[in-house]
Interface confidence: medium
């Protein structure tokens, strides 16, 4: 069949599966006179043969891992054995079959992880190699955790990136790992080829021992410090410690205090630098920060709480220079005149601020001394002996001693004797009608004016009117302010009105005097008034708890992982349905009921971080009102990129035969983040068998030199495997291949007869 299995001599490429016994010829070349026979040269490896008549075949199974491409040349000879046609290049590409199992580089791995480490952040890599072609499923590896020991409550604390072999904590592992409970774990990890997708895949396993170390970067317990300490300062009160030595510590005062009496040294010990005053400030909250050698924060700040303990260093103080009370003529014995409330700046509800009251003097002592008594602990003044007469003594002055356990203070009280309170307040109308308001009426709004009058002595407690809402407002949404000159009452909104809980309120006001009524006079219906408040509904949209929700996850987090959640409430109490808007990359889904957000696709930091979407909360039923908030997902980089060659190095060659050892320079890179100093790669030969012919030496963090050790190379392509290690934590290694050809040169360029592909650069060394 001309063309497929036979034809004239020309450059050709054939693809043959490895591992298959020969079953047919490769090609039959036809001779054109004067050619009569054919000759085969190149990388035959004694496998490829051409018969004199032009029949090209192979005599045993090929092995791609030994040689992936055989570069052959076929020439046509005349009867005298002189080349009359060719040689032309014949390329045999060996196609891969899955004839190599993956193998882990180590049979046992050891690593450590700090408790509370970020979920998804790799702390250890397992690495397997497979000699099969990585461009086909045969060489595509899939890592899996087979078992975790111990397994507590069937919860996996560890996860593995099935492509990179990066081991990290799950969210549960980050929260629950505790070296005090379980200091070590063992994982059995499997690796499969065929991308893990085939029943016929080969596999290998390895064991990983993991030590859990304590995370010591945590907030200390709250500290108590006695005020006015006379001990020498500074005094150590607590400490923080970063997980590794060399951190720089500092304190941050978020409150921006005029004096900040705390310091931290470079061990992480925290000191109070001067005596504290509880009455100036009873508690301090500040932050300890750990920074690296450049001054950049290493982690989140820790909150430090200091409570200042009270001592009795303050005397009682009077409420005003003179406290004025009123008492009616003819008031009965035991009636309350008023309460003297002194203050003490020391801590409330302690012995240091517990006060005693005692009358030390009364003037005038008419008609006798001891007309008044004061309750020892409450400070309430009472009429002790008899009723008073305004025309005899219109005013009394009392000196009262107020004491705590260490200090005494004198306070002064003036008691004015006033006419009897025998008139009740009378409302100008008993019913103020209906008032309709929307539930979103502003707090502080005056919604109604009420008025009562009292015929007692003006500008005394007998005629002053206090308005109280005694019915219809158990929530305290309304209040009444009184004008002291006119006794007008202004009804104001104190708390938001709410249609859902109180659509109609029947409000009852009572007008009363601060002074008690005389015996026999009682408040009656004239002192009461009512009105009806009708609240109308305003449908309000759901309200998110935050304007922006932010979450942080590792970019290699497993699909289906919860990456964050949002919350909103509906003022009307309707159920809420959550949805996402603007998920342009299709990475996320939201639980419509709970607001939890999950990943549904692989995340990629390099595509942009943070990833911003909008979350929508919509009422279920009602008017279907909705609100929008932002969700920002910060994607953390993982060291998931092994080093690789910085560019395509096909076409490297040395002119054969070598006159002296030669060398060439190549550059490595990787796609991970690097701090100030850039990559710091180390280079070595990929296998021991290469060391007789080659050596590799580092030039700097990114470049290395590949040199020949001798000059005795065959005229063919050599594939030099080079191991590049990124020196990361943990280190990640890439094995790259540099194809180097030793070839005959013409004018310093590699001589590639007919069939040389144009466009591939060639570099001579």
């Amino acid at each position: 069949q001309e063309g497929k299995f036979s034809g004239p001599l020309k450059p050709m490429t054939f693809s043959i599966y490895e591992g298959q016994e020969p079953s047919q010829i490769i090609f039959q070349f036809k001779a054109n006179p004067p050619a009569v026979t054919f000759e085969l040269t190149g990388e035959t490896d004694n496998i490829f043969v051409i018969e004199r008549e032009g029949l090209l075949y192979y005599n045993r199974a090929l092995d791609r891992e030994t040689r992936s491409t055989h570069n052959l040349q076929v020439a046509a000879l005349d009867a005298n054995g002189i080349i009359v046609e060719g040689p032309v290049p014949i390329t045999i590409k060996v196609k891969d079959i899955n004839d190599n199992r993956p193998t882990f580089l180590q049979s046992k791995y050891e690593g450590s992880v700090r408790q509370n480490s970020r979920p998804g952040k790799p702390f250890l890599y397992v690495n397997a190699t497979d000699l099969d072609d990585p461009a086909t499923p045969n060489g595509q590896l899939y890592y899996q955790i087979v078992i975790q020991l111990p397994m507590i409550n069937n919860v996996m604390y560890f996860q593995i990136n099935n492509k990179t072999g990066a081991i990290s904590l799950t969210r549960e592992g980050s929260q629950e790992l505790n070296p005090a409970k379980n200091p070590s774990y063992n994982l059995v990890i499997s690796v499969k080829d065929m991308g893990g997708q085939s029943e016929n895949s080969f596999s290998d396993t390895t064991s990983v021992d993991i030590i859990v170390t304590e995370n010591i970067w945590k907030a200390p317990k709250p500290v108590e410090m006695v005020e006015n300490s006379t001990d020498p300062h500074p005094i150590k009160i607590t400490q923080v410690r970063w997980n590794d030595p060399g951190a720089q510590y500092s304190l941050v005062d978020k409150e921006k205090l005029p004096r900040f009496p705390f310091s931290i040294d470079q061990e992480g010990d925290i000191y109070v630098t001067q005596p504290l005053d509880r009455e100036e400030k009873d508690a301090y909250v500040f932050y300890a920060v750990a920074k690296d050698e450049y001054g950049k924060p290493l982690s989140y700040p820790l909150e430090i709480h200091v409570k200042v303990k009270d001592i009795n260093d303050n005397p009682p103080t009077c409420p005003s220079p003179v406290t004025v009370f009123e008492v009616q003529e003819n008031e009965r014995l035991g009636n309350s005149i008023g309460t003297l409330t002194a203050h003490d700046r020391d801590e409330e509800n302690t012995a240091n601020s517990f006060l005693n009251y005692r009358i030390v003097e009364q003037t005038p002592k008419l008609p006798m001394d001891g007309l008044f008594l004061i309750q020892t602990y409450a400070g309430m003044l009472q009429l002790a002996k008899q009723s008073l007469k305004k025309q005899d003594t219109p005013q009394y002055n009392l000196t009262i001693e107020v004491s705590d356990k260490d200090f005494k203070t004198l306070c002064f009280v003036q008691i004015n004797v006033i006419d009897i309170n025998d008139q009740i307040p009378i409302f100008e109308k008993s019913d103020y009608g209906n008032l309709t308001l929307a539930e979103d009426t502003n707090i502080g709004s005056t919604i109604l004016t009420i008025q009562a009058t009292d015929a007692d002595e003006p500008f005394t407690g007998s005629s002053k009117i206090l308005y109280h809402i005694i019915k219809g407002d158990s929530e305290g949404r309304l209040g009444v302010d009184t004008d002291p000159h006119t006794n007008t009452g202004y009804v104001i909104i104190k708390k938001p009105l709410d249609f859902e809980t109180a659509a109609v309120s029947n409000i009852v006001f009572k007008a009363e005097n601060p002074e008690p009524l005389v015996f026999g006079v009682k408040y009656n219906a004239s002192s009461f008034a009512k009105f009806t408040l009708i609240v109308t509904d305003v449908n309000e949209a759901p309200q998110f708890s935050q304007h922006v929700f932010q979450a942080k996850v590792s970019e290699d987090v497993a699909i289906g992982t919860k990456v964050g959640n949002v919350t909103a409430k509906d003022p009307e109490g309707l159920d809420i349905s959550y949805s996402l808007r603007g998920d342009t990359r299709g990475w996320l889904k939201i639980d419509h009921v709970t607001g939890e957000i999950f990943s549904v696709a692989p995340l990629d930091r390099e595509a942009g971080s943070p990833y911003r979407v909008q979350v929508v909360a919509t009422e279920v039923g009602g008017s279907s009102l909705s609100s929008v908030s932002e969700f920002h997902l910060i994607l953390m980089d993982v060291n998931d990129n092994p080093p690789r060659l910085a560019k395509d190095y096909t076409g490297l060659f040395f002119c054969h035969p070598l006159s002296a050892p030669g060398s060439l320079i190549f550059e490595a890179t990787d796609d991970d983040q690097h701090l100030f100093r850039g990559p710091h790669f180390t280079f070595s030969l990929g296998s021991g068998s290469l060391q007789n012919d080659w050596e590799v030496s580092k030039i700097n963090g990114t470049h290395a030199r590949l040199s020949t050790r001798h000059t005795e190379f065959e005229e063919r392509e050599y594939v030099v495997l080079i191991r590049i290690n990124d020196g990361g934590r943990p280190p990640l290694e890439g094995i790259v291949s540099l194809p180097v050809t030793f070839c005959s040169c013409v004018e310093g360029s590699c001589f590639r007869p007919a069939g040389h592909q144009t466009g591939i650069p060639t570099v001579g060394m």
Epitope: P297, G608, S609, P610, L635, M636, D637, Q673, F676
Partner: nanobody
Framework: EVQLLESGGGLVQPGGSLRLSCAAS????????MHWVRQAPGKGLEWVSA????????YYADSVKGRFTISRDNSKNTLYLQMNSLRAEDTAVYYC????????????WGQGTLVTVSS
């Protein structure tokens, strides 16, 4: 290709002011924390300041707090550092850098601009 290009450096007297700019391209500027880092002659690198994408969060090293102000204009893809009350010890090459979060390593940074404070 990510590029960060600093400008605005120069010679200034002690007590004077300078404003540095950093023009960013090749990435979504508003998605990243941006930093200023400096290196004084013969000394190591020192982190100076950082700002979140919205400009709502800013951080400063103690040595510049109260004197330097970091800001950004996302519409112009530009980062700024306003330096007031300059001192001789502020003499350094100032670099701008980016990172996805405050605590992450810098993934790119610029070539730097020299600030010299001298009378």
């Amino acid at each position: 290709e990510v590029q960060l290009l600093e400008s605005g450096g120069g010679l200034v007297q002690p007590g004077g002011s300078l404003r540095l700019s950093c023009a960013a391209s090749g990435f979504t500027f508003s998605d990243y924390w941006m930093h200023w880092v400096r290196q004084a002659p013969g000394k190591g690198l020192e982190w100076v300041s950082a700002i979140w994408s919205s400009g709502g969060s800013t951080y400063y090293a103690d040595s510049v707090k109260g004197r330097f102000t970091i800001s950004r204009d996302n519409s112009k893809n530009t980062l700024y550092l306003q330096m007031n009350s300059l001192r001789a010890e502020d003499t350094a090459v100032y670099y701008c850098a980016k990172s996805p979060t405050l605590y992450d390593d810098f993934d790119y940074w610029g070539q730097g601009t020299l600030v010299t404070v001298s009378s």
